[in-house]
Structure formats: C-alpha cells, structure tokens
C-alpha cells in the first residue's frame, strides 16, 4: 500500500499471515527491502535466470519469515510481539516505491464463561447478576448481552431482574466478538432463579 | 425513555481544571458503557475513550491519556469528563453518548461546550 | 488505527435526489461494528444507522446502509429538505473506536 495509510493487516495469534506486495508495472526490480518497525527485517535480490537472493537480518523472526514468488512477506506462528509497522521498499533503475503495513495480532476468542451472583428477594422477585468472561480477553473485545434479540448490555456483565410468576422462561445470550472470532454461551433465567431459591430456602431451614 | 442529561457550558482560563457530568435516566445504568466524544468548533466527531459503568475501568484514546479522566457515580446514574490544566485547544463540544451492543452511540447527550480563553 | 475515509465531503443536491455516501475503512471491519450517525446544525449526533444496515429507532424508511469488508454506504431514496445534516460513519471493532471526517449534505 504505497498511500500515507498504511494497510492493516490483521493475523491470528499463532497462525499465518502473508504482507501483499505489488510490482511496479513492467520495470526491472534491483533489490527489495523488508523492515520491521525502522529495523531491517529481510533484504532480496531478484534474478531473472536463477533464484533470488534472500538474506534474512532479524534473526528473531527469520525462520518464521518466508517469501512468495512476488516476493510478498509470509510470516508464520503469529506471536503478539509481531504487532507494528511493516514497510517493503521495491527499488528500481528509476524510482523506489514504498509499500507501510500495520500487522494487529489478534487472539482467537477462547473459553467463554458466565459467573453469576444472583439474590432472591422476599418477593420471590430474582435479581440476576452475571458476568461473562474470555480467555485472556483485551480492549479489542466487545461484550453483549441479548434476550429476544434485544441488546440487554453493552459490557460483560448484566444486572437484570426476573419474577417467575410474571415472566416466561427466559435465556440470557453473552455474545464475545473480536475481529476474527466470535462466541457466545447462553443461560436460563429460570434455572439460575431456581438455582437460587433451594439456596435461599436451605438457609432458611 | 433513555435519556442523557449533561452540565451546561463552561468558560474556564488555560490551566485551570473542569468537570462537565452526564446524568443518565431511562435504563439500567451499571448494564450501558459510556461514551466521551469530542468535536472542536467547525470539526468532525473525535471519541476519547469510554467507562465500563459496572466495574468503573476506564478506556481512554492516546491523545486524551492524561489530562483526561472519566469517572461515575452509579448511586445518581451519572457519569463525569474532568479535563485538567486547561489549554485553548480544548475549546470544543463534549458529548456523552452510550455505548451500544455493538459500540455504536445509540443515545447522546446535548453536549457541552467548554471554551478555554484568557 | 483503523481510517475511516468518506466521500464526497460534501454535496449539494435537490429534494427528492437519490444521495449516496461511501466510507472506506482501512482494514475489514464486521458489519456488526459499521455504524452512521447524522448531525444536524447545532445539534447531538443521533444514531441513524447500526450494524451496516438496522435502521436506529425513528429513522424514515428512505435511509439505508449496506456494505461489507472496507467499503461501506448510506444511501437516501428520496432526499427531504429536513435531510440537510453532516453524515458520520463509525467503527466499533477495534480500539481505538473512530469516526469518518463526515459528509456535508446541503439542499439546493
């Protein structure tokens, strides 16, 4: 992407992503050279009758760096500390192009769980306080509660009060999302109420 | 029905401090985030960063990191912006808005203007 | 962060126009996460359009919204004179959130 706007890639922590590079139409290409935030990540020289040159200078990615035919940067087992700014500098008889990336390292969503801290009062009305949870969850993750296909909540958790003797049986979905995944694990009103009130009438005994 | 109330507009001195408040009403306000948006005279919309209403964890955009705190009080469903140290680029609208299922605004405040000026 | 780039800037157009508004993300986005908003002179924001193309609560039939990836569009049918607004694209998905210069639509 040889715009001010560097083109964002996203990978997927521990899988494998590919920094598409496009050739200057019809020009002979000298040499390319990969960067890694301002640091020299790989250096290639093309030829047209025998393999290119590849001389790979950052050792910490260099056997997880590959190049395809175009000469396009393929890097494999994604970790978090891939993330940055990527830059392909194509120099030719006449110019030089610049191609900027930035490569965001996302986690597959993993491991979703409902906690929930839920009171029954004298009334018999159940109030219900749930809290949904990822693994290893960051700010790139959006939480949603929905019943009925009504956003209920914005965040992961869900305060939310339910009477059994005027109210049907009612699911409550947590919905995880991020950019490459999403997950969601629903619970029942009903069954968390019930849950509650032998608890509630152990106490009492 | 929702509603977002905010504080009226405020002319404050460079460096002094200001705390602008958004008064929420028609939900359950510990189960919506909410939103901080700013749009300087004649600009476009700039979020700076947003509140978990329940455990009251902060999010804040890098050119709001600082000077910039969110805060809430649950007990009156209001959430608060408090800008320190003042500068005439701060003279601007501030928006609260709540954070959708699907971090869309869906309700806004009427937006208070702060203007910063000697 | 994620550019949101939208075009034209500003339009002028006649009552009863077909106006469409593009925005150009710079890295896919969720159609969960596309969201237009409209602001009139002197006014809030008001959410128009969410999740690429549910209709906000109140918001007249002859608004749209379609798209998917990185190019997104608002289109209104039948341009009214009380559709003069600047038109605001948003995405939801990654932090930080961000917001599209905004279109200006003037009514001739």
């Known amino acids: 992407q040889s715009s001010l706007t560097p083109l964002m890639v996203n990978g997927i922590l521990g899988e494998s992503v590919t920094l598409p590079l496009e050739f200057p139409a019809g020009e002979k290409v000298n040499f390319i050279t990969w960067l890694f935030n301002e640091t020299s990540l790989a250096f290639i020289v093309p030829h047209e009758t025998k393999s290119p040159e590849i001389h790979v200078t950052n050792p910490k990615q260099g056997k997880r760096l590959n190049f395809t035919q175009s000469y396009s940067l393929q890097l494999s087992n994604l970790k978090m500390e891939d993330t940055g700014s990527y830059r392909a500098q194509i120099s030719t008889k006449t110019s030089a192009k610049l191609s900027s990336y930035t490569l965001r390292i996302l986690r597959q969503l993993r491991n979703i769980q409902v906690t929930n801290h839920s009171q029954l009062f004298q009334n018999m009305t159940c109030e219900l306080h749930l809290t949904c949870s990822v693994e290893d969850a960051d700010d790139n993750v959006s939480f949603r509660w929905e019943a009925l296909g009504n956003t209920l909540s914005s965040q992961p958790n869900l305060t939310v009060s339910w009477d059994p003797r005027i109210s049907s049986e009612q699911d409550y979905t947590c919905i995880a999302e991020n950019a490459v995944s999403n997950l969601s694990f629903s619970v029942s009103a009903q069954k968390l109420c019930e849950d509650v009130k032998i608890q509630y009438t152990d106490t009492k005994m | 029905q929702v509603q977002l109330v905010q504080s009226g507009s405020e002319l404050k001195k460079p460096g002094a401090s200001v705390k602008v408040s958004c008064k929420a009403s028609g939900y359950t306000f510990t189960n919506f985030g909410m939103n901080w948006v700013r749009q300087a005279p004649g600009q476009g919309l700039e979020w700076m960063g947003w509140?978990?209403?329940?455990?009251?964890?902060?999010t804040y955009a890098d050119d709001f990191k600082g000077r910039f705190v969110f805060s809430l009080d649950t007990s009156v469903s209001t959430a608060y912006l408090q800008i320190s140290s003042l500068k005439a680029e701060d003279t601007a609208v501030y928006y609260c808005?709540?954070?959708?299922?699907?971090?869309?605004?869906?309700?806004w405040g009427q937006g208070t203007l702060v203007t910063v000026s000697s | 962060e994620i550019v949101l780039t939208q075009s034209p800037d500003f339009q002028s157009v006649t009552p009863k126009e077909k106006v469409t508004i593009t925005c150009s993300a710079s890295?896919?986005?969720?159609?969960?996460?596309l969201h237009w908003y409209q602001q009139k002179p002197d006014q809030s924001p008001k959410l128009l359009i969410y999740?690429?193309?549910k209709l906000a609560s109140g918001v007249p039939s002859r608004f749209s919204g379609s798209g998917s990836g990185t190019d997104f569009t608002l289109t209104i049918n039948s341009l009214e004179a009380e559709d003069a607004a600047t038109y605001y694209c948003q995405q939801g998905i990654y932090m930080p959130l961000t917001f599209g210069g905004g279109t200006k639509l003037e009514i001739k």
């Open positions: 509140i978990n209403t329940y455990s009251g964890e902060a």
């Open positions: 808005a709540r954070r959708g299922g699907t971090a869309e605004f869906d309700y």
């Open positions: 999740r690429t193309s």
């Open positions: 890295s896919s986005i969720s159609s969960n996460f």
